[in-house]
C-alpha cells in the first residue's frame, strides 16, 4: 500500500518498520494542531509519547578500543509528557532503575518542556508529511543496511519500558543514509493506538496509520549517545508505518508472540535474534527525510528522520495484539503512545522520489513547490 497521494509504484505496505527515538519525544503541537503544549487528542491525532529509546533508553556505544564493543543502555534522563485528561489510559511512563531524572508520560503533567526544555524546540518530531510539498532530491540514494540479518543466538532483550516495547540491538548493525552518512543501529521500538484508533507518530496528509516502527541509530562519528544528542545528524531514525493486511507477518510475529511475557511495565524477556530488515519495508529507495527530534523527552533535535514510503503489513490480529497486550504505569494499558505532530516551522521534507507526482485524479497537475537542498552531498 502507499501513503495517501503517493505514486502508485511506491506502495506503502508490505514491509517492516523500525524507527525509534533513542531519547524521547513529547506531545507538542503539530503543524495542523494548534500550537498548544497540551494538545488534546483529536479524532485521530491523540497525543502520545512512548518510552522510545529515551535518553535513558538509548544504548551507549563504546569506542571499539574497549573490550566489549557492545551497545549498552545508557541512563539517560526521563521526563513526563503532558497528559491528556480525556485519555486516562494514555499515561504510560517509564520507570527505569537508576534513573535520577524525573519521569514523563503521555498525557497529563508535567508538560514535556518542563521535563526537557528541548521539547519546546522549533524543529520537533513527529510531523505531518505532505507529499505534494516534499522536495524531490535525487541525491537521496537507496538506504544501505548491513548486518541486520541476525542469527537466533545470541538472544535479544525485549522490554516493556512503560512507554513502548523496545528491542535492544547488538553491535554490528550498520546503516548508511548515503556516502559518509554512516550509522549503527541501537534499538527499535513501536508506537501504536488502541482499538479502532490509529497510533502512528508521523501522519501523511493528516492520515494516521495504525502503528509505526522506529529503528534508532547512532552516527559512527560518535562513540556514545550522549555525545550525539542535539548534534545535527548525531542520531538517525528509520520509521515505517504499519498497516492492516490479510496475512500474518511472520517477522513481526517473532516479537508479538512474546508480548504476553512482558505485559507488565518494566518487565523484559529474551527473544531469538531475527532478520531486523524484515521488519522494514522492502523498498529502501523511496522515502521521505527531514531533520527533527526525538519524539519523547529529552526531545533532542538534530535527529535525521527517514520515513519509508512503503508500509509494512500486519494482520488485524497482530495489530490488536500490539495495542492490547501491554500495560503501563498505574494499572493503565499501554496504548496511544504517540506524540502529536509538530509544526515544520519552515523545514522542508525531502523525498528520494518524485512524491509530488501523483497519478490519481486528485492531482491533475501536481507542482513541486520545494526544491532539493542537496542533502547527502
Amino acid at each position: 500500500q502507499r501513503l495517501p497521494r503517493m505514486q502508485e509504484d511506491s506502495p506503502l505496505g508490505g514491509g517492516s518498520s523500525g524507527e525509534d527515538d533513542p531519547l524521547g519525544e513529547e506531545d507538542l503541537p503539530s503543524e495542523e494542531d494548534s500550537p498548544r503544549e497540551e494538545d488534546p487528542p483529536g479524532e485521530e491525532d491523540l497525543p502520545g509519547e512512548e518510552d522510545l529509546p529515551g535518553e535513558e533508553d538509548l544504548p551507549e556505544v563504546k569506542p571499539k578500543s574497549e573490550e566489549e564493543g557492545s551497545l549498552k543502555l545508557e541512563d539517560l534522563p526521563t521526563v513526563e509528557a503532558p497528559g491528556d485528561p480525556q485519555e486516562p489510559q494514555n499515561n504510560a511512563h517509564r520507570d527505569k532503575e537508576g534513573d535520577d531524572q524525573s519521569h514523563w508520560r503521555y498525557g497529563g503533567d508535567p508538560p514535556w518542556p518542563r521535563v526537557s526544555p528541548a521539547c519546546a524546540g522549533r524543529f520537533q518530531s513527529p510531523v505531518d508529511i505532505r507529499p505534494q510539498l516534499a522536495a524531490f532530491c535525487p541525491a537521496l540514494r537507496p538506504l544501505e543496511l548491513l548486518g541486520f540479518q541476525l542469527p537466533p543466538l545470541p538472544e535479544l532483550r525485549l522490554r516493556n519500558n512503560g512507554h513502548s516495547v523496545q528491542l535492544t540491538l547488538p553491535p554490528g548493525l550498520e546503516m548508511a543514509l548515503g556516502p559518509g552518512r554512516e550509522y549503527r543501529a541501537l534499538q527499535l521500538h513501536l508506537h501504536w493506538g488502541a482499538a479502532g484508533r490509529p497510533g502512528s507518530e508521523h501522519t501523511v496528509e493528516g492520515h494516521r496509520f495504525p502503528a509505526e516502527i522506529h529503528v534508532v541509530h547512532l552516527s559512527t562519528a560518535f562513540a556514545r549517545v550522549d555525545e550525539a544528542l542535539g548534534r545535527p545528524g548525531g542520531l538517525a531514525v528509520l520509521a515505517a508505518f504499519l498497516e492492516e493486511g490479510p496475512e500474518e507477518n511472520s517477522a513481526y510475529e517473532q516479537l508479538l508472540s512474546r508480548l504476553e511475557e512482558i505485559a507488565e511495565e518494566g518487565s523484559e524477556t529474551q527473544v531469538p535474534g531475527l532478520d531486523i530488515s524484515a521488519l522494514l519495508p522492502s523498498d529502501f529507495s523511496r522515502y521521505f527525510q527531514y531533520e527533527g527530534s526525538l519524539t519523547t523527552p529529552p526531545c533532542a533535535q538534530g535527529v535525521i528522520w527517514t520515513v519509508f514510503n512503503q508500509t509494512v503489513m500486519l494482520s488485524a490480529k497482530q495489530l490488536h495484539t500490539l495495542s492490547d497486550t501491554l500495560w503501563g504505569p498505574g494499572d493503565s494499558r499501554l496504548q496511544l503512545n504517540f506524540r502529536a505532530t509538530q509544526p515544520l516551522n519552515g523545514r522542508v521534507i525531502e523525498a528520494s522520489f518524485p512524491a509530488g507526482v501523483d497519478s490519481s485524479p486528485r492531482a491533475a497537475e501536481p507542482v513541486q513547490l520545494n526544491s532539493c537542498l542537496a542533502a547527502g552531498d
Epitope: 542469527p151 537466533p152 543466538l153 529474551q270 527473544v271 531469538p272 531475527l274
Partner: antibody, heavy 124, light 107 residues
Framework: EVQLVESGGGLVQPGGSLRLSCAAS????????MHWVRQAPGRGLEWVAF??????????QYSASVKGRFTISRDNAENSLYLQMNSLRAEDTAVYYC???????????????WGKGTTVTVSS | DIQMTQSPSSLSASVGDRVTITCHVS??????LSWYQQKPGKAPKLLIY???NLHTGVPSRFSGSGSGTDFTFTISSLQPEDIATYYC?????????FGQGTKLEIK
Amino acid sequence: EVQLVESGGGLVQPGGSLRLSCAASGFTFTDYYMHWVRQAPGRGLEWVAFIRNKASGYTPQYSASVKGRFTISRDNAENSLYLQMNSLRAEDTAVYYCVRGGHAGSNYWYFDVWGKGTTVTVSS
Amino acid sequence: DIQMTQSPSSLSASVGDRVTITCHVSQNINVWLSWYQQKPGKAPKLLIYQASNLHTGVPSRFSGSGSGTDFTFTISSLQPEDIATYYCQQGQSYPFTFGQGTKLEIK
C-alpha cells in the same frame, strides 16, 4: 569426555509429580543452554524446555504443552539440570532426554550432546 | 509454531545407494536447521548443523543443503550401519520443532 546422565524416571499416576535429574560432565556447564527433549513411545521428538546459560541469566523457556506444569532448573555448582514435573498426564509418558545446546559461540540452537534418556510413564 | 514436514516418512534402499531426505519448513528459517540420526533404543545424534555443516566425527558420506524453507539431507553411499530414523530440526525460534522422522531401511 562430555557426558549427560539422566535419572529420576519411573511410573507415576495421573496428577502426580516427578523430578528428573541430569548430571553433566566434561564441559563448562555454565556456558551452555540446557534442554529437555522427550519422545513418546513410537513417536517423534518434542522439545520440552530449556534454561539459559550464565551469560543469559539462567532464565527458562517452556513449550506450550508443559508451561505451568513443569519447571526446569539447574544447580551450577553441582553441574546438574532438573525437570520438576507436576500435574502429570498420560500424554507426558515418554523417554526424557537431557540435551546440551547453545552457548556463547553458537549462532542458533542445535542439540549436540544427548543423554541416554530416562523413561517416565504416567498411568493409573 | 514453525511446522516441519519431512519426506518420505520411510524408505528402503540398498547398500551403496544414494539416499535423499527432504525437509520443508513452514516459514523461512535461513540456514538454522539440523539433522539427527536415531538408532532403535538409542538417543539421537547430531549429524548436520546449520543446514550443511558436518558435526565432528560424522562420516563424510552424510551431507546437507538448502536454506529458507527447503532442505535436503543426503547419504552418498548407504552403509548397513546407517539404518536409523532421521530427523530435521529448526533452531530459528522456540518452540523448537522436529520433523516427524524418516525411517530408513535396507532392502
